[in-house]
Every structure is written in C-alpha cells, then in structure tokens.
Interface confidence: medium
C-alpha cells in the first residue's frame, strides 16, 4: 500500500502557467523592499489571512487576495547599524522579521519580530467586526521580544497564544544557542525550560504548538510542542536528528524550591516515521517539517499528520505519518528514559516513579494538587531529571500513509481538509514542497478502513519560480488554499472540477471527493443535493458502476489522465 | 470596469516642469504597480517610471535624476513630476497598471495618453 | 535604438496568416516572458498575448504567441482588416535592474 503509492504519478500535473490560464491561481508576488512571508493567522470570522514578512504585516482578503491592506514596521537606522555593526547582513538579517503573529483578544493581534538581532513585540488593532475595516500597529506600545520572537530570522518560533499567555518554542539569546519553551505575557512570572541542559532540549527546531484537551476539566489542559532535535548521546550512535513531541500543562506555574519558574510537567517523546529497509535497516523520516492537527468530534482525540524529510543527502526521501493522541498519552503514561551516567546507554526506568506522577496537570481529576508550585520535592527532582520518555509514539498502522521518493523535490508543509462525499469522508491532503508545487492527496481505504491507499490526485506549481513553500492556510468557509513562501503568498481554489474533463466517466476516474459527475457536468459534490443524480465513487472510481449509459454517452474510450 | 484617466499634460519650455495626474477606478488601487510608458510621436512605446504597491520606485536612465513618480492611494491618483524637460521629452504619455498578481507581468490596463510637447 | 527589435512591417490580405517576429537576448526573451500589445490607429496600446503564449480574456483565438530561445513571435491567422495596426513586443530585461524593454514596434497592413 505506501509502497505501491510510494512515487504514484499525479492524475493531473499542472504548470504554473497552466494553473494560471485556467484561472486557478491568485499571486502576491511580494513587494520590493519586503520578502519572507512565512508567518502565517488565518482568520475565517474577519475573513482575513494575516501574514508576517520582513518589515511589514499584511491583511488579505480570503476572497481575493489582490484585495490586501499592509503595515509597514521597519527597525530604526540606529538598530540596524547595530546590527550591521555585529557582523550580520544587511538586507537578509537586519530587519524585523515578523516571527508572531497570533490572536490577542477580539480586537487585537499580537505581533513578534526579529526586529535586526534585537527581538520587538506589539500590538495591531483588528476591530471588533470584519466591516471596522481597521488594521494599525500600536506604535505607542512595544516589548521586549526575548523569548518570543528568535533573533536571527533563519529560526523559527513554535507560538500559541490561549488566555492572554503566550506559549513560544524559540531561540532566546543573540548567539541562538539558548533554545526553550517559554510563557511569557500575562499576570505570571515568566516560565521555561530548564537552561543549559540537553536532556530537555538539544538544539532543537521548532515547528507549531497546540492545545489539546485532557478530560472535560479545563484544568488539565495540555500544550503540545512539536520539535525536532539532536538526539541525546547513548540514544543514538553517531549524530542524529529525533522528531519530538513535548507536552506542558497549561497550569504549570513551576516549582517551589527547585524548578523555580520552570516547567514542572514537561515531558517529550520521540516520534517515529519509518519503513521497513531491505536489509532489515528501517529507513526513518526523522526531519520534521510540519504538522497539522484534523479536529474530531472529540476535541481531546484530533488527528496528528506530520510531515517529514530524511537526514541522509545521499537518499532524500519524504513522508507523512499519521498519529493518534490515544497513542501519544500512551506514551506519556509509559516508563520514563532513565540512564545512570554519560556513559550508559537509555534504558526504561524501572524504578519507583514518585506520586502525583511527573508530566500530570495539578486538578481535581487526577488527584489533590491545587499547583505545581505544591509538588512533592521528590517529584521536582524526578522531572528535572527524567524529561523524555523511554517509548516512541509510532504512527497509525506503524508506517507513513505516504512517502515519495527518487523525486527532485521534498515535502515542507501540510494542511488537511475532511471532505463528505457520496460513499464517506475522506481527508484530502495538500503538500508543499520545496520546489514551489502543491500536491492534492487523498487517502482511500483499501480492504479495511485502517488500510489506507494514496492517491495523487494532482500536482500544481504555484509559484513562477521554485521556490520553499514555508506556509499553507486552508479556509474550508471560503474553499481556498493559501500559500506563503520567499517571494509571495499564492491562493487558489481546493478544487477544480470542471478540469476532470467532459464526461461522466472521466469525473469518476478522477476519484477527487469534491467532485461529483451532475448529469451533464463534473462539479462540486454536495452531500444534501439528491444522491441519484450525482455519480462518484472515490473508493473504487468505477465508472461502469457509476456512470449511467446516458452519462458515459459512449464516451468511455476517450477517458484520460492529463500529464 | 478599469478606468485610467490621464491629465496634466500640454506644452512648456525646455527647462520646464510639469505634473502628470493618472485618476484609476474600477479596481483596488492600492493592490497594484502602476507604470508611465511614453511614445514619442510616430514612435514606439518606452517605458518611463513605475512604483511599486509597496511605494518603492523605479526609473529609466534617461529621465532619472529629473522625473519622480509618486502615488496617493486615498485619491486612487498616480502622479508623475517631471522636471528639466527636454525637447526629446515630447510624447504621449500613458499610465498603465501592471497585473503582476497573477505573475503575468503585463501591463492589462491602459489609459487614453495624455501629450507633453517640449518646445521653445 | 530598442532592445528587442522587431521588423518595421508586415502585410498581408484578409484570411491570410501574419508572422511577426521579436528577437532579444538571454537577460529578457532568453530569462523572461513575452507580452504582445495592439495599437490600433490613434488609440491606447492593448494587452493582446501575455506570458509568451496566453490571450486576456476577449482576445480572439486567431493570435496566438510562441517563444524559442531568445526570439518570440505572434501569429495572426484569418487575418482581418480590423487587425491593421502597430503591434509591439515587450519582456522585463534582467540586466537593466528588472525593468520592461519593448520593441521598436511592428506596423501591420492588410491589404486589399
């Protein structure tokens, strides 16, 4: 299954100047004095996708991008020949680099940037309602960005911003060295990983974090980080990146004596994303590069797919893996990685694991702890001494849903759309990559429903040169993809029906669950119109079963794939 | 429906100065680069001066230094200052908005031209 | 002198198909795309082929660009006598900091 669909050719290849003859792409193609649009907000209630570049914030329409307002906030000369004046370039360094951008409450945004080596947060006034039409920094009011926003603009920040607090993954000193997960804002003492000390954190890159829900007690609340990272001496043989999740509960306030202002319930995991070699050897995609969180009915159990790259150059390979947070609290529940000294490999802790367990939020449901900063000290020791788990989190099925391979490009972002069609739902997945394309994937179950099939549906460029797609949006209100990158931000549409062709046959074959044959057209599938007068069929695409003799009006023969 | 209306021009000394007006409708100014292309009579098309929606501007060599373009986005108004004209100067000038959203990079909107006659 | 050049003119009868050609070098036809433009007589020029080889809506199928190397041409099939006008190419020259060259611009009569 992932083997067959390992390097399956795209039903429809689209140029980027196909794309745009058919009306199919949108481009901002950025403006000269500004670059890096890679920080993403997508807000579906304003109808506005906020995007943080080099020196300025913009606010699209998500209707039409070509509709946009922008704030320009450059850094002062004086902070730029500081900047200049430390050894760092001019145009690709010394300037602010928006980094944050998260919402503050209805009427505000938060904003970080690099601010050229010397990290600067505000405030930017949104309104109350989409028709306030307002967007204008609070230039009145700036903060220190240390420990918010990195310094150097190669670096990423993981950011969250949930009741006035903001949760920030990033480098926190000039040299970005000093890596930590940080709270910062709000009416508490700023709280962080612990400092100098590899087994919390070992040079670690960034990628997104989210809140997930424990139980229906607000209390025990968690926030999940997703990393990756050099992993730990003894835990690997030679240098080598480990993918990461790392949780904190939300009501860590630190401890009393010992991890004063630092997490006290900080636990990470390995994530494992690999396939069986011929030699015995799994190949593993440990670089990850993004991941995106597809909400479920129960909001504690939304579905992880992350996106990963291979360490190797000589084989340059990507995945996506699917994880489930059943397995990832299963591992957090599990034995703890212990090792008696630098020498010694990691074994499973088989000692007495102190009471209230490390890593669980201090509630009402799991016990009598009111807070952290009332914890055992045996716990404290525990924790500052045993942040990683012994156990991976494997993927759902034990194996990628899907790799790619012998191919000149890698996978960079993922967004995910639940779509109902005719026979079930289906997540479409779409890809970026770092050559400028977008891939549209959907997962088929083939035999049993946990026996997922790939299927490239398409492979659209969306930028006129190659360029790293660094951001992707998906407003399932407005139907639209939207895509940040170096040179711009793209938009296009999350189907193109009409370009399956002419007949019913060639729209069943396209097996796109947006897409349904009408009777006289290929359009978008809508699961209240009538059933008997649309034809789809996404597990199968048989058209024989499917397309009425009327439907298929003897045109079976001319059925094609585009390439 | 796009509209570009060009005003401004007429006939002045060597030497002289003059402001061109480009009034746009019909489309969100502000989202896009904006050009003057000039044509001197019974000659082809040359580009003159553009700037960007970010502001930023560009001129060719041979009006650098004299020529500067601006816009004002509240008036949906581009502008072209020209000084120390030449006679060399004397054209049809055209405003004209460039789609470089959809990376067609093109000039898809055209006004009617507006002529500068350079003479003594 | 323009930096793309172009032949001065080009005729034809109606029906007939028109070639007219636009050569340059590697820093703008060779790296960049080719526009198109029409000028009818005492008129604004018009978009007619953008991106080497696509028509703006409203534009007949009847013209249609190509481009090889670092040469572009526009042909004309059917050719009508509301077609008699100055047709120019255009494309943004690397070497001269990104900024648009046309051609010298090429006058097409229909005859008859």
């Known amino acids: 299954n992932y083997a067959n669909g390992k390097n399956n050719v795209p039903r429809l290849k689209l140029s980027y100047k196909e794309m745009l003859e058919s009306n199919n792409v949108i481009t901002f193609n950025g403006l000269a004095n500004s670059s890096s649009y890679h920080t993403f907000l997508l807000d579906e209630e304003r109808s506005r996708l906020y995007v943080g570049a080099k020196d300025h914030i913009f606010s699209f329409n998500l209707v039409n991008i070509k509709d946009f307002q922008k704030i320009v906030w450059p850094v002062s000369y004086t902070r730029r020949d500081e900047c200049k004046w430390a050894g760092k370039d001019i145009l690709k360094e010394c300037a602010n680099f928006i980094k944050v951008l998260e919402a503050y409450n209805q009427t505000h945004l938060y904003a970080c940037g690099t601010g050229a080596f010397h990290p600067i947060c505000t405030y930017i006034e949104v309104g109350h309602h989409p028709e306030d039409n307002i967007f204008k920094l609070q230039d009145s009011h700036f903060e220190n960005g240390r420990g918010k926003s990195p310094y150097d603009p190669k670096l990423l920040t993981a950011s969250l911003l949930i009741d006035g607090e903001l949760y920030s993954g990033t480098a926190a000193d000039f040299m970005g060295r000093d890596f930590a997960i940080f709270r910062t804002l709000g009416h508490h003492h700023p709280i962080r990983t612990e400092q100098h000390d590899s087994r919390w954190l070992n040079d670690p890159r960034f990628i997104s974090a989210h809140l997930i829900p424990e139980s229906d007690n607000p209390e025990d609340d968690k926030v999940y980080f997703f990393f990756r990272e050099n992993a730990i001496d003894g835990e690997h043989s030679g240098k080598a990146t480990h993918a990461r999740i790392g949780q904190i509960c939300k009501n860590d306030f630190g401890g009393h004596r010992s991890l004063v202002n630092k997490w006290t319930t900080f636990l990470k995991a390995r994530l494992i994303c690999s396939v069986p070699g011929p030699n015995g050897i799994d190949t593993h995609f440990d670089e990850l590069q993004d991941v995106f969180l597809m909400n479920s009915k129960d909001p504690k159990n939304p579905i992880v797919y992350g996106v990963f790259t291979t360490s190797s150059n000589i084989f340059k390979g990507s995945a996506v893996c699917m994880y489930s947070m059943s397995d990832v609290r299963r591992v957090f529940l599990g034995p703890y990685a212990h090792r008696d000294g630098p020498n010694y490999q990691w074994v499973p802790y088989q000692g007495r694991v102190p009471y209230p367990r490390p890593g669980t939020c201090p509630s009402k449901t799991f016990g009598g702890f009111d807070s952290t900063k009332d914890l055992p000290d045996d716990v404290i020791t525990f924790a500052r001494s045993h942040p990683a788990m012994y156990n991976p989190v494997f993927p759902i099925n034990n194996r990628p849903i899907m790799i790619k391979t012998d191919v000149n490009y890698q996978f960079t972002q993922i967004v995910v759309d639940r779509v109902d069609a005719e026979d079930g739902q289906y997540d479409v997945m779409f890809i970026g990559t770092d050559v400028g394309t977008v891939l549209k994937v959907v997962s088929v179950p083939k035999e049993t429903w946990h026996d997922l099939e790939e299927i490239l549906l398409e492979e659209m460029t969306v930028f006129r040169e190659p360029t790293t797609i660094s951001a992707m949006e998906l407003s399932t209100k407005q139907q639209q993809l939207y895509i940040g990158s170096t040179a711009g931000v793209a938009q296009l549409p999350l189907h193109r029906c009409d370009i399956y062709g002419k007949a019913c046959a060639e729209c069943c074959l396209a097996r796109d669950p947006y897409c349904a044959w009408d009777g006289s057209s290929c359009s978008r599938y809508f699961p209240t119109a009538k059933a008997r007068t649309r034809a789809q069929d996404i597990r199968n695409g048989d058209p024989l079963t499917h397309c009425s003799d009327g439907g298929i009006e003897g045109r079976m023969d001319h059925h094609h794939h585009h390439h | 429906e796009v509209q570009l209306l060009e005003s401004g021009g007429g006939l002045v000394q060597p030497g002289g100065s003059l402001r061109l007006s480009c009034a746009a409708s019909g489309f969100t100014f502000y989202s896009y680069a904006m050009s003057w292309v000039r044509q001197a009579p019974g000659k082809g098309l040359e580009w003159v001066s553009a700037i960007g929606y970010g502001g930023d501007t560009y001129y060719a060599d041979s009006v650098k230094g004299r020529f500067t373009i601006s816009r004002d986005n509240s008036k949906n108004t581009l502008y072209l200052q020209m000084n120390s004209l030449r006679a060399e100067d004397t054209a049809v000038y055209y405003c004209?908005?460039?789609?470089?959203?959809?990376?067609?990079?093109?000039?898809?909107?055209w006004g009617q031209g507006t002529l500068v006659t350079v003479s003594s | 002198q323009s930096v793309l050049t172009q032949p001065p003119s080009a005729s034809g009868t109606p029906g007939q198909r028109v070639t007219i050609s636009c050569s340059g070098s590697?820093?703008?036809?060779?790296?960049?795309?080719v526009n198109w433009y029409q000028q009818l007589p005492g008129t604004a020029p018009k978009l007619l082929i953008y991106y080497d080889d696509l028509r703006p809506s409203g534009v007949p199928d009847r013209f249609s660009g190509s481009k090889s190397g670092t040469s572009a041409s526009l042909a004309i099939s059917g050719l009508q006598s509301e077609d008699e006008a100055d047709y120019y190419c255009a494309a943004w020259d690397d070497s001269l900091n990104d900024i648009p060259v046309f051609g010298g611009g090429t006058k097409l009569t229909v005859l008859g």
């Open positions: 590697s820093s703008n036809i060779g790296s960049n795309t």
């Open positions: 004209a908005r460039r789609d470089d959203y959809t990376s067609r990079d093109a000039f898809d909107y």
